[in-house]
């Protein structure tokens, strides 16, 4: 339904508070380097303009599209050329090219300082002095560091952030109350950002069909009692929501997400029995709850899939009638029966089925050709099962830190050209699959592990895309979305890699390491491990373990010493020499 003024329509639908928050997020995700105050000024100007349109939808410029209004506003930033370089060229373009240009300049790894958490008392004072500015600053800092963060979900995080300060700044022990809550929000936020980044990559790099296939599989697992037509409707609506958010249309996205939550709750009887609690919550919590809701129970006595998809003589007729609908039904039927499979596995099975039909339906006797198609699924199912079994055994044997180190070595040998910070970040996250998923029973391990790995490997792909250095990474990232993990798993040591020159500076450590948190100290050690492997890619596990053990002992010894800096200088030289000898550098 067309509105005379799109900006007035969204302002009225969302309300002033959400409108302002979403415009701030949108601007911060586009202009990631701009100071907070500049963004607040732009948001206030847009908000005042929106109010004039609410009062009179026929007022000047109120009929302009949101992209035109927001783009025009962003292009008023005085320092655009100095701060953003070629991004300023976007402003010479017309819509929709201008918005596409802004989207292409979003930076997944912006050169921004790490967010340092102030003392609790300082935070509480700032919160009490100006709650609104304090919360806006949170939105701004998260949005500029995570330019694809799911905007309506960021509103939910901000609500929880506010609640944490409201409660804890009144507590007897503020720090004990607040810090665990902030840690939880930080970790959940990073996970949420990475999950959304995969959705946007799926849409932008592989297209709507790829995203819809993912959504059919996931929603069919989650709502196995819902009919195919119902799942299809939800998939269409969900695709619209994510297409909008990934495209920077945050007001439309938030509005449509609210409509989708409303529809799901009004129709929960035909969707899932698990939605009742979610649907009693306020909007932001409701949408979050629905997105995370557990899988409903599978209907009893579901018939065998073979009847409709292998044994029926009308398989090719049904496929010809509407290929994507028939494949969608196959995916729906398979997924609702297999909550124990990862979404990416289900998509691989559907792709195998499609390839088989393409080949067999062209034959004179199709049935004879596709009769054994389900046999082709067996190795595809067993591969992730075996991989997860092996890696969970390794995780249980080593613990998270050493499991991460094993993955660091494995991935550095596969793709040694990738930057050390990226290898450390990605391998640490890959290693978290152990504590996240290995505790689950068999039936939940694969969906947990393989779908999580898809999210982490997408981080590698988007970071690598910014500065491509490895053809192997490019190949695994671009050939097939659902085969990324098997592609990386299949990579062996890169024999073409010329080892990095030895640089003693890389292995020089100082007393400041002693004051770091355990996590930061681990990252330092893991950075050294990656550098070691880059210098000596043929080093054995045993050699690397010996050097790392020596390194850990050296850090522990010097951090206990009276003159720490001298210890690091003298013992460090000995350690480098011993390591060189041990590794034959």
């Amino acid at each position: 339904d067309a509105h005379k003024s799109e900006v007035a329509h969204r302002f009225k639908d969302l309300g002033e508070e959400n409108f302002k928050a979403l415009v701030l997020i949108a601007f911060a995700q586009y202009l990631q380097q701009c100071p907070f105050e500049d963004h607040v000024k732009l948001v206030n100007e847009v908000t005042e303009f929106a109010k004039t349109c609410v009062a009179d939808e026929s007022a000047e410029n109120c009929d302009k599209s949101l992209h035109t209004l927001f783009g025009d506003k962003l292009c008023t930033v005085a320092t655009l050329r100095e701060t953003y370089g070629e991004m300023a060229d976007c402003c010479a373009k017309q819509e929709p090219e201008r918005n596409e240009c802004f989207l292409q300049h979003k930076d997944d790894n912006p050169n921004l300082p790490r967010l340092v958490r102030p003392e609790v008392d300082v935070m509480c004072t700032a919160f009490h002095d100006n709650e609104e500015t304090f919360l806006k600053k949170y939105l701004y800092e998260i949005a500029r560091r995570h330019p694809y963060f799911y905007a309506p979900e960021l509103l939910f995080f901000a609500k929880r952030y506010k609640a944490a300060f409201t409660e804890c700044c009144q507590a007897a022990d503020k720090a004990a109350c607040l810090l665990p809550k902030l840690d939880e929000l930080r970790d959940e936020g990073k996970a949420s950002s990475a999950k959304q980044r995969l959705k946007c990559a799926s849409l932008q790099k592989f297209g709507e069909r790829a995203f819809k296939a993912w959504a059919v599989a996931r929603l069919s697992q989650r709502f196995p009692k819902a009919e195919f037509a119902e799942v299809s409707k939800l998939v269409t609506d969900l695709t619209k929501v994510h297409t909008e958010c990934c495209h920077g249309d945050l007001l439309e996205c938030a509005d449509d997400r609210a409509d989708l939550a409303k529809y799901i709750c009004e129709n929960q009887d035909s969707i899932s029995s698990k939605l009742k609690e979610c649907c009693e919550k306020p909007l932001l919590e409701k949408s979050h709850c629905i997105a995370e809701v557990e899988n409903d129970e599978m209907p009893a006595d579901l018939p065998s899939l073979a009847a409709d998809f292998v044994e029926s003589k009308d398989v090719c007729k049904n496929y010809a009638e509407a290929k994507d609908v028939f494949l969608g039904m196959f995916l729906y039927e398979y997924a609702r029966r297999h909550p124990d499979y990862s979404v990416v596995l289900l998509l691989r099975l559907a792709k195998t089925y499609e390839t088989t039909l393409e080949k067999c339906c062209a034959a004179a006797d199709p049935h004879e050709c596709y009769a054994k198609v389900f046999d082709e699924f067996k190795p595809l199912v067993e591969e992730p099962q075996n991989l997860i079994k092996q890696n969970c055994e390794l995780f249980e044997q080593l613990g998270e830190y050493k499991f991460q180190n094993a993955l660091l070595v494995r991935y550095t040998k596969k793709v040694p050209q990738v930057s050390t910070p990226t290898l450390v970040e990605v391998s640490r996250n890959l290693g978290k699959v152990g504590s996240k998923c290995c505790k689950h029973p068999e039936a939940k391990r694969m969906p947990c592990a393989e779908d999580y790995l898809s999210v982490v490997l997408n981080q590698l792909c988007v970071l690598h895309e910014k500065t491509p250095v490895s053809d192997r990474v490019t190949k695994c990232c671009t050939e097939s979305l659902v085969n990324r993990r098997p592609c990386f798993s299949a990579l062996e040591v890169d024999e073409t890699y010329v080892p990095k020159e030895f640089n003693a500076e890389t292995f020089t450590f100082h007393a400041d390491i002693c004051t770091l948190s355990e996590k930061e100290r681990q990252i330092k050690k893991q950075t050294a491990l990656v550098e070691l492997v880059k210098h000596k890619p043929k080093a054995t596990k045993e050699q690397l373990k010996a050097v790392m053990d020596d390194f850990a002992a050296f850090v522990e010894k010097c951090c206990k010493a009276d003159d720490k800096e001298t210890c690091f200088a003298e013992e460090g030289k000995k350690l480098v020499a011993a390591s060189q000898a041990a590794l034959g550098l």
Epitope: C316, K317, A320, A364
Partner: nanobody
């Protein structure tokens, strides 16, 4: 939507000939194997002949081997059945189908009688 329309049937004397045509629309005809099936009054449906998408493979029921010839023109989206030396037992409604599926078109009546 998939549409298959058969034509070319009629009344013919034993030993005579007919050429059936099936005009296809609503799907990528060139990607699918096609068949002719027939149904005589009071009898089960019988598969007659099949052809692969690229015409490289042609199969026939024993009852029509040497008398019937299946062919196709992918550019025109047409399937053909050339029927020679027709016998009274060839009397039936003839349908063209995708793969070896069940008929969903009206078919064309072939009657062989003196």
């Amino acid at each position: 939507a998939v549409q298959l329309v058969e034509s070319g049937g009629g009344l013919v004397q034993p030993g005579g000939s007919l050429r059936l045509t099936c005009t296809a629309s609503g799907f990528t005809f060139r990607s699918f194997g096609m068949s002719w099936v027939r149904q005589a009054p009071g009898k089960d449906q019988e598969w007659v002949s099949a052809i692969s998408a690229d015409s490289s493979t042609k199969n026939y029921a024993d009852s029509v081997k040497g008398r019937f010839t299946i062919s196709r023109d992918n550019a025109k989206k047409m399937l053909y059945l050339e029927m020679n030396s027709l016998k009274p037992e060839d009397t039936a409604v003839y349908y063209c189908v995708i793969g070896r599926g069940s008929p969903s078109s009206p078919g064309t009546q072939v009657t062989v009688s003196s």
